[in-house]
Amino acid sequence: MKVLQEPTCVSDYMSISTCEWKMNGPTNCSTELRLLYQLVFLLSEAHTCIPENNGGAGCVCHLLMDDVVSADNYTLDLWAGQQLLWKGSFKPSEHVKPRAPGNLTVHTNVSDTLLLTWSNPYPPDNYLYNHLTYAVNIWSENDPADFRIYNVTYLEPSLRIAASTLKSGISYRARVRAWAQCYNTTWSEWSPSTKWHNSYREPFEQH
């Protein structure tokens, strides 16, 4: 049994890091493998993660951690019984994938303005809370070409757009994702999408 693709890990910079790897053949990850991880810190202890299958030869493990700080470094040991298959390390702050924003809501009752709001996925005491920026994706269910991205580079989790920038009388969907420039993170997953019917009063044309 050998590791074909070494574990790569990403952290949500809160409580979970996710590591994925591939074996050289079909593997029952949960029964054959164990990933041991240990914070390099005074009086820390090794913790065991039981991996799950992620495709035939792929494995994934969700590592539970204390809230993360930038200096944290973890040692990782991948075991198959008594055989050490791979040894490495992981610095969560250098491999951050933020949590996805939640509670995306479209408020359509503000005089021809669409107000989209969502929730920051981090508690106020987490470093990322004040460092997230967002991308909002809006698309038409009827017209695949009607697909747009709005970059929200301010901290407030909201976006205002004129309803007239979208077509009237049709349904739209929106979703939002987050990233943090300070840690050069990857983008989060998209939030669940929300749907609304876009309708607004066409301005009266004078001739």
Partner: antibody, heavy 120, light 108 residues
């Protein structure tokens, strides 16, 4: 309420032994690294010893290494410090301390302290 | 072993004034591992700040921490009568725990 209550302090002669206990309540002891910190009369804080959540790893300040032994009984939510070959300079108030996170984040819970006096 | 040196040894100020307490490490340390404690006579120490700048639960916002590398600061923006005490900085790191010798903040 999260609390730590030390006991076992007292007067002991140089070269003697003493065992301090710390009873934890309001939280699960096995989830945290635990420590002992001491303070000699009129002096500052001095780190003494620490132990990992399950007791598999220990750490000692150089001043007590080889003389003190830290241990824990997680099912009984109790921390111990066995002190032997005591010296006059070990005279201090001994505090039992919990760390904020599993391992780190500052010492957020302190006991009221138990006094150890080493004197002939 | 890393040594923490606090200054001044004693600081005499009046209520309402701003207090700035310094803690210098003998070598670079991570901001994640620097904490500050307050101790009043006859009482156990109380955690004020951890991770250099994060306030512990229940600590008023007049207390703030800053710094990096070897130089760290605890600031009390407007001194209240109950703030007069001894303050300790602490390194709680990957391989050791060390306290500074303390700064006594007294009423002028």
């Amino acid at each position: 309420e999260v609390q730590l209550l030390e006991s076992g302090g007292g007067l002991v002669q140089p070269g003697g032994s003493l065992r301090l206990s710390c009873a934890a309540s309001g939280f699960t002891l096995s989830s945290y690294a635990m420590h002992w910190v001491r303070q000699a009369p009129g002096k500052g804080l001095e780190y003494v010893s620490g132990i990992s959540p399950t007791g598999g790893s220990t750490y000692y300040a150089n001043s007590v290494k080889g003389r003190f032994t830290i241990s824990r009984d997680n099912p009984k939510n109790t921390l111990f410090l066995q002190m032997s070959s005591l010296r006059a300079e070990d005279t201090a108030v001994y505090y039992c301390v919990r760390v904020k996170g599993r391992y780190r984040g500052g010492m957020d819970v302190w006991g009221q302290g138990t006094t150890v006096t080493v004197s002939s | 072993e890393i040594v923490l040196t606090q200054s001044p040894g004693t600081l005499s100020l009046s209520p309402g004034e701003r207090a700035t307490l310094s803690c210098r490490a003998s070598q670079n340390i991570s901001t994640a591992y620097l904490a500050w404690y307050q101790q009043k006579p006859g009482q156990a120490p109380r955690l004020l700040i951890y991770g250099t700048s994060r306030r512990a639960t229940g600590i008023p916002d007049r207390f703030s921490g800053s710094g990096s590398g070897t130089d760290f600061t605890l600031t009390i923006s407007r001194l209240e009568p109950e703030d007069f005490a001894v303050y300790y900085c602490q390194l709680y790191g990957t391989s050791s725990v060390t306290f500074g010798q303390g700064t006594k903040l007294e009423i002028k």
